[in-house]
Every structure is written in structure tokens, then in C-alpha cells.
Interface confidence: low
């Protein structure tokens, strides 16, 4: 339904607090380098304007679109050209091109300083002094570093962030209370950001049809008792929500997400028996809970799929009549019967089924042609099953750190042109699949592992897209969304790669490594490992293990020495020489 003033409509729907928070997130995701104070000023100006429109929807400029209003406001930033360069050219464009231009300049890896966590007392004082500014700063810092973070979900994170400080700043041991909560929020936040980045990549790079197919499969697994019409409605609404958020339309997105949660809870009897607890929660918790809800039990009496999709004489007729609907129904029926499959596997099966029908429905005897289509699924199902089995065995044998190292070596050999920080980040995350998924029983391993790997490989794809250096990465990232993981798995050592020149500086370490956290020390060692492989891509596992063991011993020895810096200088030279000899450099 059309509103005279879109900004007044959203302000009234969302309320002032959420309105201001969402506008701040939107601005910080677009202008990632702008100082906090500048953003707060812009948000306050927009909010005051929105209030005038609430009072009188016919007031001047109140009929303008949100893109026009927000874009005009962003384009008032005085330092736009010197801070953002060519992004300033967006301001010469008209809507909708101007917003598209801003979207294209979102940076997945902005050049921003690492967020350093202050002392707990310092944080608690800041929280008590000015709670509102403290929480706004959190939204700003997360949003500018994660320009595709799902905005309504970030409001949920901010609510938990506030709750943690409210509780822990009064606790006897503030640090013991607060730090684990902040660690949990940080880890969950990174995971949430990466999951949403895949949704946006799916919509932006592969289109609405790809996203809808993903949603049909996932929702059918989650709500196997819901009928196809219900799943269709949820998919349509969910697609609208994510299209809006990925497009920077955060107010509309948050409003529509709230409407969707309301609809789901009003109709839970026909959707899922698992929603009761979620639907008793307040809005932000409710939406989060629904998004994470466990799969409902499968209906007991589901008939064989073959009857409708292979044996029926009407298969080609039904397919021709409405191709996407028929394929959607196939995906729905297959997914609700297979919570044990990953979404990407289900999508590969649906693609195989589609390809078979395209070929067979044009053949002389269509039924004869597609009669064995389900046999083609067997190798597609077995490939991820075998891969997960092998990798979980390796993980159980090595533990997380060494499993990450094995993946670091594997991926550096596959795509050695990729930057070392990206290889370290991506391989560390790939390695986390072990502790995340291998503990699950067989029936839950594949959806856990392969869908998680899709999220991590998408990180590689978006980082690589910013500065493309490898044709192999580009190929795996762009050819097929659902075949990215099999594409990367199939890559062998890149024989065309010319090894990097040896640089002793890369392997020079200092006493500061001793004061690092265990995680940061691991990253230092893993960075060295990637560099070793880039210098000597044909090094064997045994050679690399020997060098890494020597390196670990060297760090341990020098961190215990009285004169640490001298130890690192002298023992470091010996280590480099020994490593060069061991690797034949």
C-alpha cells in the first residue's frame, strides 16, 4: 500500500530508537571511512526531518524516496572525494543509479584498524558515562567493517551487547563475567556476517532465482510439515527481506522482517511445531530464534518421490506447464525428506533433474530417457559424504590447529597467487569445520559441513573479487554457486605457479611474539607456513612438518630466554639456514 511519505511510514512502524539505529548502520555500511561523529550528525538530521514528516506527511520533501533522502544526505559529506575517491562520482548520478553506485563501492576488506578491546574497567566507565553513545559506537564499528551485515540482526546483537554490560559492570569480577560474553558475541557476529554475505552474493551475482531455490530447499528441510503453498509464501517474503537488506534498504528490510516473523507466529500450526518458544519472545529475539529454529519432524507417511517425478506419465506435461514451479515442488519434496543433505547438494540434485528433463522431454521416448534419473544422484550424494568422512578422520587425528595447517598447505598449493592474509583467514575458517561439525552424528554432518564451507568459500570469493589474482579462483567462484566447494576440492597443485623469491625478512621474528595470545601466535606461525609453501610449493608434508616443529621449538626457547631479542636474532638466523637446507631452497 502506497504511503504519502515513505520516511514517515518507516519511522512510525519501527519507532525512533530502531529508526536511528538502522539509519546509522546504513550510513556506516556505505561510508565506511567516515568518523563516528559525522555519522551521528547525519543520522540526527535525518531523524529530525523524519519527525517533521510524521507531523505532516505533505511537508516539503517528505514524498521523496528513502534512497533519494539518504543519498542526498550522504552526498553532503564535505570530504567525500578525498576520503573515497571515485565513489564521489556516485553523487553526480540520479536514483536509482546513485544507490547502485554506492552499493558497488562497498568494501568487504576496508582499510580500518583492528578493533582493540580496552580494559574492562575502561569499557564499563564508558558504558555508564554515556550508554547511548557507547551502543551507537558498537553499531558503527561493526557496520563499517561488515558492510553487508544483516541490519535487523545487528540490532539483536546490540541488544545482547547492552545486556552484557548492564549485567557484568555490576558483577564482583567484571572481567570473568564480561569477556566470555564479548568473545561469544564476536564469534557469533563474524559467523552471522559471513552467512549474510553469502545470501547477498547469491542475490547479486546469481540472481533472485538462485536465492529462491536456496530458500525453498532450506525452509523445506526446516518445515517439512508445511505444504508447498506455505513454503512458497515464506520464500517470496524472505527473498524480499534479503533483497532489501542486501540493497541497502534497511528500514524496509527490518519492517518486512518483523512482518514475516508476525506471520510465521500467527500461522505456526501450519508451519512447524518447533516455533512455540520462539514466538513467545520479544521481536528481535523472536526473529533470531525463528531463523535458527531446529528442523521439525518429518511427516510419517510421505510417499515415494519416484511416483510424481519419475513414474508419472505427466512429468513432461507438468514440467512444460510451469518449469520453475515443478522444479520448486521437486526441490520441496526432496528437501523435506532429506534433512541429512546439505542445501547445496539438494540444489545440485535439482539441477541434475532439470538438465535431465530439458534433454528427455524433447526426446522420442521421454519416460525411457528420464526413467533412471535418480541413479544419477548417487555419485553426487556420495562425493560430499566421502569427503566429510575423510576430513573428519583427519581432524580427529590432528586436532584443530594442525588440521588448519593441513588445509593451509592444501589451499596454498591450489591457489598460491592469493594473498597470504586471505589464505590464512580462509584456511583457518575452513579448518573450524572440524570442531563445528565432526562432533555431529552422521545425519547432521553434511548439512553442517558443506553449507558452512559454502559460507567460508564465499569469503574467499568476495575478497578475491576485490583484487583478482587467480583465474582458478575466479572460475570456481563464478561458474556455479552450488558447485563452488566441489570446484575447489577438485583443484590440484597449480603447476603454472612460479615460486616466490626467498626473503629472509618474512621469517624474521621478534620478542613481541611472546606476548601475543595463543590465537595470534598461531596466526604468525600459519603465515610463515603459507610463505614457506609459496617459496617451495613442491615441499612434502614431512619437510614442512619438520620445519614447523623446529619453528615452534625456536619460539618456545626464545620466549623463555632472559634476553629474548638476542635469542630471536641469533637463533632465528640458524633456523632460516636450517630450513633452507631442509627444503632445498
Amino acid at each position: 500500500d502506497a504511503h504519502k511519505s515513505e520516511v514517515a511510514h518507516r519511522f512510525k512502524d519501527l519507532g525512533e530508537e530502531n529508526f536511528k539505529a538502522l539509519v546509522l548502520i546504513a550510513f556506516a555500511q556505505y561510508l565506511q571511512q567516515c568518523p563516528f561523529e559525522d555519522h551521528v550528525k547525519l543520522v540526527n538530521e535525518v531523524t529530525e526531518f523524519a519527525k517533521t514528516c510524521v507531523a505532516d506527511e505533505s511537508a516539503e520533501n517528505c514524498d521523496k524516496s528513502l534512497h533519494t533522502l539518504f543519498g542526498d544526505k550522504l552526498c553532503t559529506v564535505a570530504t567525500l572525494r578525498e576520503t573515497y575517491g571515485e565513489m564521489a562520482d556516485c553523487c553526480a548520478k540520479q536514483e536509482p543509479e546513485r544507490n547502485e553506485c554506492f552499493l558497488q563501492h562497498k568494501d568487504d576488506n576496508p582499510n580500518l584498524p583492528r578493533l582493540v578491546r580496552p580494559e574492562v574497567d575502561v569499557m564499563c566507565t564508558a558504558f555508564h558515562d554515556n550508554e547511548e553513545t557507547f551502543l551507537k559506537k558498537y553499531l558503527y564499528e561493526i557496520a563499517r567493517r561488515h558492510p553487508y551485515f544483516y541490519a535487523p540482526e545487528l540490532l539483536f546483537f546490540a541488544k545482547r551487547y547492552k545486556a552484557a554490560f548492564t549485567e557484568c559492570c555490576q558483577a564482583a569480577d567484571k572481567a570473568a563475567c564480561l569477556l566470555p560474553k564479548l568473545d561469544e558475541l564476536r564469534d557469533e557476529g563474524k559467523a552471522s556476517s559471513a552467512k549474510q554475505r553469502l545470501k547477498c552474493a547469491s542475490l547479486q551475482k546469481f540472481g533472485e532465482r538462485a536465492f529462491k531455490a536456496w530458500a525453498v530447499a532450506r525452509l523445506s528441510q526446516r518445515f517439512p510439515k508445511a505444504e508447498f503453498a506455505e513454503v512458497s509464501k515464506l520464500v517470496t517474503d524472505l527473498t524480499k527481506v534479503h533483497t532489501e537488506c542486501c540493497h541497502g534498504d534497511l528500514l524496509e528490510c527490518a519492517d518486512d522482517r518483523a512482518d514475516l516473523a508476525k506471520y510465521i507466529c500467527e500461522n505456526q500450526d501450519s508451519i512447524s511445531s518447533k516455533l512455540k518458544e520462539c514466538c513467545e519472545k520479544p521481536l528481535l529475539e523472536k526473529s533470531h530464534c525463528i531463523a535458527e529454529v531446529e528442523n521439525d519432524e518429518m511427516p510419517a507417511d510421505l510417499p515415494s518421490l519416484a511416483a510424481d517425478f519419475v513414474e508419472s506419465k505427466d512429468v513432461c506435461k507438468n514440467y512444460a506447464e510451469a518449469k520453475d514451479v515443478f522444479l520448486g515442488m521437486f526441490l520441496y519434496e526432496y528437501a523435506r525428506r532429506h534433512p541429512d543433505y546439505s542445501v547445496v547438494l539438494l540444489l545440485r540434485l535439482a539441477k541434475t533433474y532439470e538438465t535431465t528433463l530439458e534433454k528427455c522431454c524433447a526426446a522420442a521416448d521421454p519416460h525411457e530417457c528420464y526413467a533412471k534419473v535418480f541413479d544419477e544422484f548417487k555419485p553426487l550424494v556420495e562425493e560430499p559424504q566421502n569427503l566429510i568422512k575423510q576430513n573428519c578422520e583427519l581432524f580427529e587425528q590432528l586436532g584443530e590447529y594442525k588440521f588448519q595447517n593441513a588445509l593451509l598447505v592444501r589451499y596454498t598449493k591450489k591457489v598460491p597467487q592469493v594473498s597470504t592474509p586471505t589464505l590464512v583467514e580462509v584456511s583457518r575458517n575452513l579448518g573450524k569445520v572440524g570442531s563445528k561439525c565432526c562432533k555431529h552424528p552422521e545425519a547432521k554432518r553434511m548439512p553442517c559441513a558443506e553449507d558452512y564451507l559454502s559460507v567460508v568459500l564465499n569469503q574467499l570469493c568476495v575478497l578475491h573479487e576485490k583484487t583478482p589474482v587467480s583465474d582458478r579462483v575466479t572460475k570456481c567462484c563464478t561458474e556455479s554457486l552450488v558447485n563452488r566447494r566441489p570446484c575447489f576440492s577438485a583443484l590440484e597443485v597449480d603447476e603454472t605457479y612460479v615460486p616466490k623469491e626467498f626473503n629472509a625478512e618474512t621469517f624474521t621474528f621478534h620478542a613481541d611474539i611472546c606476548t601475543l595470545s595463543e590465537k595470534e601466535r598461531q596466526i604468525k606461525k600459519q603465515t610463515a607456513l603459507v610463505e614457506l609453501v609459496k617459496h617451495k610449493p613442491k615441499a612434502t608434508k614431512e619437510q614442512l612438518k619438520a620445519v614447523m616443529d623446529d619453528f615452534a621449538a625456536f619460539v618456545e626457547k626464545c620466549c623463555k630466554a632472559d634476553d629474548k631479542e638476542t635469542c630471536f636474532a641469533e637463533e632465528g638466523k640458524k633456523l632460516v639456514a636450517a630450513s633452507q637446507a631442509a627444503l632445498g631452497l
Epitope: E227, F228, A229, E230, S232, K233, E321, V325
Partner: nanobody
Framework: EVQLVESGGGVVQPGGSLRLSCAAS????????MGWFRQAPGKEREFVAA????????YYANSVKGRFTISRDNSKNTVYLQMNSLRPEDTALYYC?????????????????WGQGTLVTVSS
Amino acid sequence: EVQLVESGGGVVQPGGSLRLSCAASGGTFSTYVMGWFRQAPGKEREFVAAISQNSIHTYYANSVKGRFTISRDNSKNTVYLQMNSLRPEDTALYYCAASRFTSWYTADYEYDYWGQGTLVTVSS
């Protein structure tokens, strides 16, 4: 192509009842959302009622809630509209419609196939 044929219309007194039927052929009936719409002389077509594939969901316009009941029999490829406590303002041409992939049961543009209509006149 799905063909829809409505029947059961006629003249009835205020407070009376009618049962409309819509027989479908040419498609897999159980995969369609089915709806009833109506158009009074000189007015726009308006939503009356809809029913999802397995009869789990039914939707009604506020003006007919509590008086009209939509149902379907997938084994007979037929959808019904039971109309009770009829009023003069219910006078209209009633259309049956089928939708393959819908999210808004009440929007006529979501429906792919339409019948020719059956006339209902409520008059004393």
C-alpha cells in the same frame, strides 16, 4: 493449460444459500491454490476466498467472513464456495481462479487461470 468451469449460480432471496462449484481439468489440481473472486456491475473485481493446495489454509474477505466457506476435493478436481446468509450486496459475477506459485492469496494478479464466471443475484 488449466480449464476452469464454474456452476451453481442463480437467483436467491436475501438470507438464502447457494453452493458454487468449480471443476478443473488439464493440470495437476492438487498443486494449485484455488480462489474465488467476484465482480459486481460497474465495480472492480474483488477477492472473496482462497484455499491452499492441501486445504490447510483458507482466506476470506472481511465482507464474507463467517457467511461463506471455501473447500476443495482434490480427488474430484473441484473447489466449492458455500454461501449462506446472502445479502443484496453479494450480487455479482463469481469467478474461480487457480494459482501455481502464490504468496498473496488475495491478489488477483497472482492467479494464472480463470473461469468464465457464474452469476449470483440476491434479490427479493
